[in-house]
Amino acid sequence: FERTRSLQDPCSNCPAGTFCDNNRNQICSPCPPNSFSSAGGQRTCDICRQCKGVFRTRKECSSTSNAECDCTPGFHCLGAGCSMCEQDCKQGQELTKKGCKDCCFGTFNDQKRGICRPWTNCSLDGKSVLVNGTKERDVVCGPSPADLSPGASSVTPPAPAREPGHSPQ
């Protein structure tokens, strides 16, 4: 059935970058300027995305593929295909409805984007805090207090070597 349909449908022969023009007896016409078709057999071409304002063009639109946008300096992409440009903040802050706000105590952000996340809880791994956390940096965990008691060695045996990217068997 598919083969029969494709034989009967002249539009199926129209390649990407063209559209099947009903106004011209279903011949394949090139996509007009500022439009594209990324697959064959299309009856219309899609309008190219325009990267305006805080969006800037990462890849120009062609007859077969849409434009791709990223963000101007001071902004970063959010969402699939960079659907949103969000303002950067400083390290140690997160962007809220009220603007860039410092991370509250116990949280940090080491980037200009994203959210304030809680410091690592060293005690969950039986370790102690070696270096305190700040708004910009996570805590650094060290050996457990027991490991540091007199007479105890602070050197732990090395873990068995494992190739990166491989799961343990």
Epitope: G53, M84, I115
Partner: antibody, heavy 123, light 109 residues
């Protein structure tokens, strides 16, 4: 599958209190702002409050400021709305909804919504 | 706060017709900060459009959004029976509380 399930609604007298909960599943709860939005019977939508992924930033509508408190427990994947000094005009279906973008503390639109829980304030 | 005014209040149309819904803001809103929702009786709202013109996941291409500044439009190119519902616009612009329009009901003529 993303799911949000509200609970805790019911009938309460004016001046009373109620705590709503929203249990989330199917996504990384701690990566998203979460909103409360309400809808009075036969009326439109009204945004109530939202909270940033780890609770450092909260926002409230003027109509509930000082009476409602939003909070979250990321270890339980649960959002809360503590409602005090309730008034007749707080009667509504309360929805929790997930922020449009992850890893942002900014209040955007909402892409997933729960089915809502009805709060009735009446004597 | 930014007030959103939707018009018309009710739109009476037949299946197959084109629906044009308007949302006007009391002050300028960047197009990145405007969304449209659909709500059917007894159901939660459903996100249709965000960033004024981006379709949400799973939304048919008969729904399109446009506009900038203070004037925004939701267009349903060809109404299907399941499209008869109430539609809300919403803004989430900087420093202003999130607000919704009062809604436009699209009903069967």
């Amino acid at each position: 599958e993303v799911q949000l399930l509200e609970s805790g609604g019911g009938l309460v007298q004016p001046g009373g209190s109620l705590r709503l909960s929203c249990a989330a599943s199917g996504f990384t709860f701690s990566a998203y702002n979460i909103h409360w939005v309400r809808q009075a019977p036969g009326k439109g939508l009204e945004w109530v409050s939202d909270i940033s992924p780890y609770g450092g930033a909260t926002n409230y509508a003027d109509s509930v400021k000082g009476r409602f408190t939003i909070s979250r427990d990321n270890s339980k994947n649960t959002l809360y709305l503590q409602m005090n000094s309730l008034r007749a005009e707080d009667t509504a279906v309360y929805y929790c909804a997930r922020n449009l973008y992850e890893l942002s503390a900014y209040s955007y639109g909402a892409d997933y919504w729960g089915q809502g829980t009805l709060v009735t304030v009446s004597s | 706060e930014i007030v959103l005014t939707q018009s018309p209040g009710t739109l009476s149309l037949s299946p197959g017709e084109r629906a044009t819904l308007s949302c006007r803001a009391s002050q300028s809103v960047s197009s990145s900060y405007l969304a449209w929702y659909q709500q059917k009786p007894g159901q939660a709202p459903r996100l249709l459009i965000y960033g004024a013109s981006s379709r949400a996941t799973g939304i048919p291409d008969r729904f399109s959004g446009s506009g900038s500044g203070t004037d925004f439009t939701l267009t349903i190119s060809r109404l299907e029976p399941e499209d008869f519902a109430v539609y809300y616009c919403q803004q989430y612009y900087y420093s202003s509380p999130i607000t919704f329009g009062q809604g436009t009901k699209v009903e069967i003529k």
